[in-house]
């Protein structure tokens, strides 16, 4: 038994036929010693007398609000809730399995940007006697603060004969660091109580994995002279992180009729405009995704082809500008060739995802992530890799990136990746290895030395352990190169002469 909140207790029960249940001792919160009686819920039947009441809790009939009285006056209450465990598994009767992205997904969370603000939601078919309370933190062993509001009913839907209720909650990390590479996941815990049944649900994620931008805004069409083509332009959504030269998006533009089966024109772009072929009765749609980390696409923003007006809104500030490779010096050393670094780091992002595209969706955290990926270098809040830090002195950040590149380059050349099951040298991992080396050499020319981090001794004996480690290393590499790519894109756009 444990206390959920003041005067509310949860009794954990193994739920099987003829289970002995739990013996619970309730104590009346009063200085009185004599003449105390106990009742359950609305019943006037006296269950026992004395300052303590011992009960055997086996089923829901034994749960409820126990009240101690003296001479018709209520002294205190204790509400007992039951938490069922069947075959070693805690019950999940209150919430509906959303089955996306995998089975046993009860909580789903999304973030519109990297500010540390996110929304979680869940579904239930229960309409009454239902309460939720939500707690969250960054990390679990030494938790950092995340503040969550109250859960509210956000939608009602009819599914066949049943009504389905969606509840949601908004949370905000207290000291968010949008530019940093997350090393500890956000933990979300939802306590659900239906009548006398208690259940708890948890979700663990990095903000980067739950990013889903809002749709692009202000779509504008401009027909091109003497052509079937139309220039479509748009802007970054207001809710997306700034500056856009650092937090860049990529876009997918599509022209399609009302039916999905109709023919279409489709083009991908990093810019905030594109030229497409518009057809009568078709619509132009644009959606957005983080440019350097493959999280979710936004919903589509659409405009009908027939509305081809010549008015043009601003075309957004999304394009990370080019700029030459000669860069102004910064305090503490010379600058890298920002544009070359930008191109190579973007290539690294692509390679990191093609080396293991599903890594971002595999939940390997249960497998004891801490002892492996805690050893890899992360770009942290104080490393100067945020836009302001880069402006002040980019050397701190570049040194950190260089350390990480060398570290991962050594890891990819180690027994973890060279051992069985073997990978061919020109596999995406092989290309990734070569590109890591290439970028690290761009950052640190001959004769200029920064200290490098020691490689941990991760020498797995079994091929399956090696495979698991590869997944984990590639997963954290995806996050690392995304931050590095943002740094170089921003540098190329703002720090180039």
């Amino acid at each position: 038994i444990w206390e959920l909140k003041k005067d509310v207790y949860v009794v954990e029960l193994d739920w099987y036929p003829d289970a002995p249940g739990e013996m619970v001792v309730l104590t009346c919160d009063t200085p009185e010693e004599d003449g105390i009686t106990w009742t359950l819920d609305q019943s006037s039947e006296v269950l026992g007398s004395g300052k303590t009441l011992t009960i055997q809790v086996k089923e829901f009939g034994d749960a409820g609000q126990y009240t101690c009285h003296k001479g018709g006056e209520v002294l205190s209450h204790s509400l007992l809730l039951l938490h069922k465990k069947e075959d070693g598994i805690w019950s999940t009767d209150i919430l509906k399995d959303q089955k996306e992205p995998k089975n046993k997904t009860f909580l789903r969370c999304e973030a519109k940007n990297y500010s540390g603000r996110f929304t979680c939601w869940w579904l239930t078919t229960i309409s009454t006697d239902l309460t939720f309370s939500v707690k969250s933190s960054r990390g679990s062993s030494d938790p950092q603060g995340v503040t969550c509001g109250a859960a509210t009913l956000s939608a009602e839907r009819v599914r066949g004969d049943n009504k389905e209720y969606e509840y949601s909650v908004e949370c905000q990390e207290d000291s968010a660091c949008p530019a940093a590479e997350e090393s500890l996941p956000i933990e979300v815990m939802v306590d659900a109580v239906h009548k006398l049944k208690y259940e708890n649900y948890t979700s663990s994620f990095f903000i980067r994995d739950i990013i889903k931008p809002d749709p692009p805004k202000n779509l504008q069409l401009k027909p091109l002279k003497n052509s079937r083509q139309v220039e479509v332009s748009w802007e970054y959504p207001d809710t997306w992180s700034t500056p856009h030269s650092y937090f860049s998006l990529t876009f997918c533009v599509q022209v399609q009729g009302k039916s999905k089966r109709e023919k279409k024109d489709r083009v991908a772009t990093d810019k905030t405009s594109a030229t497409v072929i518009c057809r009568k009765n078709a619509s132009i749609s644009v959606r957005a995704q983080d440019r350097y980390y493959s999280s979710s696409w936004s919903e589509w923003a659409s405009v009908p082809c027939s509305g081809s007006g010549s008015s043009r809104g601003g075309s957004g500030s999304g394009g990370s500008g080019g700029g030459g490779s000669k860069l102004r010096a910064v305090p503490g050393g010379s600058s890298p060739a920002w544009t070359q670094c930008q191109q190579l780091s973007q290539k690294l992002c692509t390679l990191a995802w093609s080396a293991h595209p599903l890594v971002g969706h595999m939940d390997l955290r249960e497998e004891g992530d801490e002892e492996t990926t805690n050893d890899v270098p992360h770009i942290q809040c104080g490393d100067g890799c945020d836009p302001q830090g880069l402006r002040d002195n980019s050397q701190f950040c570049l040194q950190r990136i260089h350390q990480g590149l060398i570290f991962y380059e050594k890891l990819l050349g180690s027994d973890i990746f060279t051992g069985e099951p073997s990978l061919l040298p020109d596999s995406p991992v092989g290309q990734l290895h070569a590109s890591l080396l290439g970028l690290s050499q761009l950052l640190q020319p001959e004769g200029h030395h920064w200290e490098t981090q020691q490689i941990p001794s991760l020498s797995p004996s079994q091929p399956w352990q090696r495979l698991l480690l590869r997944f984990k290393i590639l997963r954290s590499l995806q996050a690392f190169v995304a931050v590095a790519a943002r740094v170089f894109a921003h540098g190329a756009a703002t720090l180039s002469p």
């Epitope: 990529t250 022209v255 089966r261 023919k263 083009v267 990093d270 072929i277 057809r279």
Partner: antibody
Framework: QVQLVQSGAEVKKPGASVKVSCKAS????????LHWVRQAPGQGLEWMGW????????EYAPKFQGRVTMTTDTSTSTAYMELRSLRSDDTAVYYC???????????WGQGTMVTVSS | EIVMTQSPATLSVSPGERATLSCRAS??????LHWYQQKPGQAPRLLIY???QSISGIPARFSGSGSGTEFTLTISSLQSEDFAVYYC?????????FGGGTKVEIK
């Protein structure tokens, strides 16, 4: 399944015109864009243009503008590509292809060899 | 127009080996890049679209990667039927353009 059958080989004199046909089957003709791509002997592929059979809209590669005309006959599900003022370097295999997507080529015809020779 | 450059022009590989073909664009084309295979006397066949998307019916040994200006087609273990010419094609802007092709021949 979607199929494109092209007309037979042609031999033409320089300055003449050629009209190649492409008969579609296995799908609703107006549901797919139709492109023409050519390939000179031993050379690579060269895109000529597209037509939307639904409305007759066309877009031609600048290189062929003014010399090529693409048309369709929806009653027979047939597309045509006419190339005028033929030169010897127009000798090539001409392919039609169809796709629901405008910018790449999914289903190809078997090709029509056009030889331009005096 | 966007110029597509493929390398190498000819690639000699033994059956069972891995082949890596490169395609470079004269300007950034995001992921608007498609790969085709052409055997002698046949029409080309679409292998990969939008840089990395696989086509149903195409063997899993064919995979694509890249974005921006550099792209790669990888054939993980060459089979006898894979010896052919491979073309990349950009769809970023009209006119649509192809690379000059890479001939994969038996070593």
């Amino acid at each position: 399944q979607v199929q494109l059958v092209q007309s037979g080989a042609e031999v033409k004199k320089p300055g003449a015109s050629v009209k190649v046909s492409c008969k579609a089957s296995g799908y609703t003709f107006t549901d797919y864009y139709l492109h023409w791509v050519r390939q000179a002997p031993g050379q690579g592929l060269e895109w000529m243009g597209w037509i939307d059979p639904e409305n007759g809209d066309t877009e031609y590669a600048p290189k062929f503008q003014g010399r090529v005309t693409m048309t369709t006959d929806t009653s027979t599900s047939t597309a045509y590509m006419e190339l005028r003022s033929l030169r010897s370097d127009d000798t090539a295999v001409y392919y039609c292809n169809a796709n629901k997507e405008l910018r790449y080529f999914d289903v190809w015809g078997q090709g029509t060899m056009v030889t331009v020779s005096s | 127009e966007i110029v597509m450059t493929q390398s190498p022009a000819t690639l000699s590989v033994s059956p069972g080996e891995r082949a890596t073909l490169s395609c470079r664009a004269s300007q950034s084309i995001s992921i608007n890049l498609h790969w085709y295979q052409q055997k002698p006397g046949q029409a080309p066949r679409l292998l990969i679209y939008f840089a990395s998307q696989s086509i149903s019916g195409i063997p899993a040994r064919f995979s694509g990667s890249g974005s921006g200006t550099e792209f790669t087609l990888t054939i993980s273990s060459l089979q006898s039927e894979d010896f052919a010419v491979y073309y990349c094609q950009q769809s970023n802007s009209f006119p649509l353009t192809f690379g000059g092709g890479t001939k994969v021949e038996i070593k």
